[in-house]
């Protein structure tokens, strides 16, 4: 990000780890939905977790806002909340379901599963 | 979002506000920007905030892999973080700045103003 | 190479309730879809519902309010239950295997050899 | 549910000669969603063909199948005395799954 450069390097002081990938296992089951899913019945979606603290790291991909949030928040936590780790990147995953007319449907759903991390 | 019309209608107890856009003023001399920004010296960012409940209303335009997460976070927070606030749709601004080699430059910056907000 | 052995009483009285097992062997049962099928003597094939190894089910509708399909992965078995049976649910009861990827699905391979079970008082 | 109907319900033929079994649907099956397979006095059934032209594994080329929607097609190119059997269809494009009524190929 263009402003990215401007942000300083004042280091952090919270060793809870920064934004980046975790798993998450999805059970279809357990979220009820197989009664209309086939396959798969489970799969690894991952989810973003962490601090984004400043300054913002160039592989997190802030945005221009996000430099400027992350700045603030820096210089005034309380006036200014932080920015937040999210998928910046998602990949799809076909699924075979059975449809509302009971017909089995194999179909690509978009953003199911998080392929990398950012502050935003 | 496909995956949206098959969260349920568990109504929220959170009396929090929900994901909505709120005000962040931007003061480039308060972050000592000053000495390279000529103009705007200041402006309205916005920015994010608020809870990300199950269920995601559409107007929050949940990815799927965030439906998923979501529910998923509302029948065990504990093992699965709630999805985030975080903006959706973003403007540029122009702005006229001094570069290296003291020239004054007209440049439009991206990604600077909040439109949006959802959960993520 | 998988194989599959159906096992339960050759006989129960109408009104009862059929219950069958089927071992699954050289194979984990998880990751596939386990299916029950009968077929009465003489007649065709009737699907009557499967199981996935995390307890997902689905059955045939007019069978569904009698019927229960369950599964123990710790003894790689899976099991039916036909409640309230009558002559008519006389059959040759048989266990098979569907692959549950999206790219192979909604076929049985292999098939148990069947079972005979007679409903008779 | 989709219902299959096969004909002839019974085929009379020699060894050598080539068998054509039809099975019809009462809709249309999604992706060409069928199996067939055979069966012999006293066994179970055995999967010849899925996805309405794929062999399964270990069959012999000289079955084949055909077809789409709601037509399909199982030929048998030059009869074996072991291919004579009951030969069932069965879609997996709508649930519930359904099992043709059968076609009987029998030694003319």
């Known amino acids: 990000a263009p402003l990215a450069t401007r942000q300083g390097k004042r280091p952090s002081k919270n060793l809870k780890a920064r934004c980046s990938r975790k798993a998450l296992h999805v059970n279809f089951k357990d979220m009820g939905w197989d009664d209309w899913i086939i396959a798969p019945l489970e799969y690894e979606a991952f989810h973003c977790e962490g601090l984004c603290e400043f300054p913002l790291r160039s592989h997190l991909e802030p945005t221009n806002h996000a430099v400027i949030q992350t700045l603030m928040n820096s210089m005034d936590p309380e006036s200014t909340p932080p920015t937040c780790c999210v998928p910046t990147r998602l990949s799809p995953i076909s699924i075979l379901f059975i449809d509302s007319a009971n017909n089995v449907v194999y179909k690509q759903y978009e953003d199911m599963v998080v392929e990398s991390c950012g502050c935003r | 979002a496909p995956l949206a019309t098959r969260q349920g209608k568990r109504p929220s107890k959170n009396l929090k506000a929900r994901c909505s856009r709120k005000a962040l003023h931007v003061n480039f001399k308060d972050m000592g920007w000053d000495d390279w920004i000529i103009a705007p010296l200041e402006y309205e960012a916005f920015h994010c905030e608020g809870l990300c409940e199950f269920p995601l209303r559409s107007h929050l335009e949940p990815t799927n892999h965030a439906v998923i997460q979501t529910l998923m976070n509302s029948m065990d927070p504990e093992s699965t973080p709630p999805t985030c606030c975080v903006p959706t749709r973003l403007s540029p601004i122009s702005i006229l700045f001094i570069d290296s080699a003291n020239n004054v430059v007209y440049k439009q910056y991206e990604d600077m103003v909040v439109e949006s907000c959802g959960c993520r | 190479q998988v194989q599959l052995q159906e096992s339960g009483p050759g006989l129960v009285k109408p009104s009862e309730t059929l219950s069958l097992t089927c071992t699954v062997s050289?194979?984990?049962?998880?990751?596939?879809?386990w299916s029950w099928i009968r077929q009465p003597p003489g007649k065709g094939l009737e699907w009557i519902g499967y199981?996935?190894?995390?307890?997902?089910?689905r059955y045939n509708p007019p069978l569904k309010s009698r019927v229960t399909i369950s599964v123990d992965t710790s003894k790689n078995q899976f099991s039916l239950k036909l409640s309230s049976v009558t002559a008519a649910d006389t059959a040759v009861y048989y266990c098979?295997?569907?692959?549950?990827?999206?790219?192979?699905?909604?076929?049985?391979?292999?098939w148990g050899q069947g079972t005979l079970v007679t409903v008779s008082s | 549910e989709i219902v299959l109907t096969q004909s002839p319900g019974t085929l009379s033929l020699s060894p050598g000669e080539r068998a054509t079994l039809s099975c019809r649907a009462s809709?249309?099956?999604?992706?060409?969603?069928l199996a067939w397979y055979q069966q012999k006095p006293g066994q179970a059934p055995r999967l010849l063909i899925y996805?309405?032209?794929s062999r399964a594994t270990g069959i012999p080329d000289r079955f084949s199948g055909s077809g789409s929607g709601t037509d399909f097609t199982l030929t048998i190119s030059r009869l074996e005395p072991e291919d004579f059997a009951v030969y069932y269809c069965?879609?997996?494009?709508?649930?519930?799954?359904?099992f043709g009524g059968g076609t009987k190929v029998e030694i003319k």
């Open positions: 050289g194979d984990s049962i998880s990751s596939y879809y």
């Open positions: 069965q879609q997996y494009g709508s649930s519930p799954l359904t």
């Open positions: 199981i996935y190894y995390s307890g997902s089910t």
């Open positions: 996805g309405a032209s």
């Open positions: 809709q249309s099956v999604s992706s060409s969603y």
């Open positions: 098979a295997r569907i692959c549950s990827s999206t790219s192979c699905w909604g076929w049985f391979d292999p």
